[in-house]
Interface confidence: low
């Protein structure tokens, strides 16, 4: 048959951050190409990345249709130069991916501190709300729009002159913290989804921002 010399894909892996979702697999093709199908668990499969020589396929536009749905993908292997034949009755070799539920499994991207503003002994720290490719009514949603109160941020802050860190938490994108007057502070934030019990419940820490630099503003 036409598929006897093709090798089934393996090591199918979902790579997803802030809902940008790529399916990766092996092996690098030698005389074969791949087509990916994704199922919204309806029993129907939608084909993507037709006859590609890549070993990855961007499935973001499919999974963002319903990020709380659970998806399964499969990768078909075809001989290089394959042209689909309507007379073919044999399915090519394929491999199933693990299940993937974007809402539960997408990694949280590294957050960014948008600004901080000191007023007396208070500092207001604002976390930049990242945009995602999730849409509602033709509008792209932010990470906060998607996760709502499921998403919190943890702020780590410390005096520039010491290493003792303090923490604060918020379920918005803003912190209001007490600081000692006349002291400079440094800040880092981390996105967290407390309801998750897996390794992807926290993002990496944001880049450190310190008072006295351009993102800050000080008012008495």
């Amino acid at each position: 048959s036409g598929t006897t010399n093709t090798v089934a894909a393996y090591n199918l892996t979902w790579k997803s951050t802030n809902f940008k979702t790529i399916l990766e697999w092996e092996p690098k093709p030698i005389n074969q190409v791949y087509t990916v199908q994704i199922s919204t668990k309806s029993g129907d499969w939608k084909s993507k990345c037709f006859y590609t020589a890549d070993t990855e396929c961007d499935l973001t536009d499919e999974i963002v249709k319903d990020v709380k749905q659970t998806y399964l993908a499969r990768v078909f292997s075809y001989p290089a130069g394959h042209v689909e034949s309507t007379g073919s009755t044999e399915e090519p070799p394929y491999e199933n991916s693990p299940e993937f539920t974007p809402y539960l499994e997408t990694n949280l991207g590294q957050p960014t501190i948008q600004s901080f503003e000191q007023v007396g002994t208070k500092v207001n720290v604002t976390v930049q709300d990242e945009w995602t490719l999730v849409r509602r009514n033709d509008t792209f949603l932010s990470l906060r729009d998607v996760f709502g109160k499921d998403l919190i941020y943890t702020l780590y802050y410390w005096k520039s002159s010491s290493s003792g860190k303090k923490t604060a938490k918020t379920n918005t994108n803003e912190f209001l913290i007490d600081v000692d007057k006349g002291e400079n502070y440094c800040f880092s934030v981390q996105a967290v989804i407390p309801s998750r019990r897996t390794a992807n419940r926290k993002s990496t820490d944001s880049p450190v921002e310190c008072m006295g630099h351009e993102k800050g503003e000080s008012r008495e």
């Epitope: 048959s1 598929t3 006897t4 089934a8 393996y10 199922s39 919204t40 668990k41 309806s42 029993g43 129907d44 499969w45 659970t70 399964l72 009755t89 044999e90 399915e91 090519p92 070799p93 394929y94 491999e95 199933n96 693990p98 299940e99």
Partner: antibody
């Protein structure tokens, strides 16, 4: 013609072993998921296990550790190795293609296995 | 484990009757609708009627229909024909890292 044909059934004593074969024609077993299902006399259908197109196997709890599904892609045949057989394993054993999403679903005619002393 | 419970276990009906068989899963089937219905006649292998809860298999008459989602499913025969007297099984698919399949205990449709 796309079909599957089971063979290897027969009479076996309790504690004995038997290997069933499922010969596929008209398609390649390396491209499909193949299941074994059984039906005890006068009873309903019971799923035994499946070998995926990737060669991975999954089993029902009732047969885990006793039954093994394998395949020979060169011969285009799927096997069910049954060990430590019990009287309650007496059934017609069916081989079927494509239980995952319902498409491409093909069943064989079945082969009878009788476990009795 | 996934368990499928059909009701009724048997029923008597006449040609032309509308027949409904229900199937309940102990937990949601894969994708909420990876649920198939089979027809089996004595001494024969099962024949696929419905897959994906509501999709008609190739060559199956349109008097057969399926509905439902999650854990509750229904097979309906809109107008029972003489050749429809048989046993019907639902079959659910479950996936949680391992694939698992389960059949209902069957519903025998007999002539009244």
């Amino acid at each position: 013609q796309v079909q599957v044909v089971e063979s290897g059934g027969g009479l076996v004593k309790p504690g004995g072993s038997l290997r069933l074969s499922c010969a596929a024609s008209g398609f390649s077993i390396s491209s499909y998921d193949m299941s074994w299902i059984r039906q005890a006399p006068g009873k309903g259908l019971e799923w035994i296990g499946i070998i995926g197109s990737n060669g991975r196997t999954y089993y029902a709890d009732s047969v885990k550790g006793r039954f093994t599904i394998s395949r020979n892609t060169n011969e285009n045949t799927v096997y069910l190795q049954m060990n430590s057989l019990r009287a309650e394993d007496t059934a017609v054993y069916y081989c079927a293609r494509g239980l995952y999403d319902g498409t491409g679903n093909i069943w064989g005619q079945g082969t009878l296995v009788t476990v009795s002393s | 484990d996934l368990q499928m419970t059909q009701s009724p276990s048997s029923l008597s009906a006449s040609v032309g009757d509308r027949v409904t068989i229900t199937c309940r899963a102990s937990q949601s089937v894969y994708g909420n609708n990876w649920l198939s219905w089979y027809q089996q006649k004595p001494g024969k292998a099962p024949k696929l009627l419905i897959y994906g809860a509501s999709k008609l298999a190739s060559g199956v008459p349109s008097r057969f229909s399926g509905s439902g989602s999650g854990t509750q499913f229904t097979l309906t025969i809109s107008s029972l024909q003489p050749e429809d007297f048989a046993t019907y099984y639902c079959q659910g698919t479950y996936y949680s890292g391992d694939w698992y399949f389960a059949f209902g205990q069957g519903t025998k449709v007999e002539i009244k």
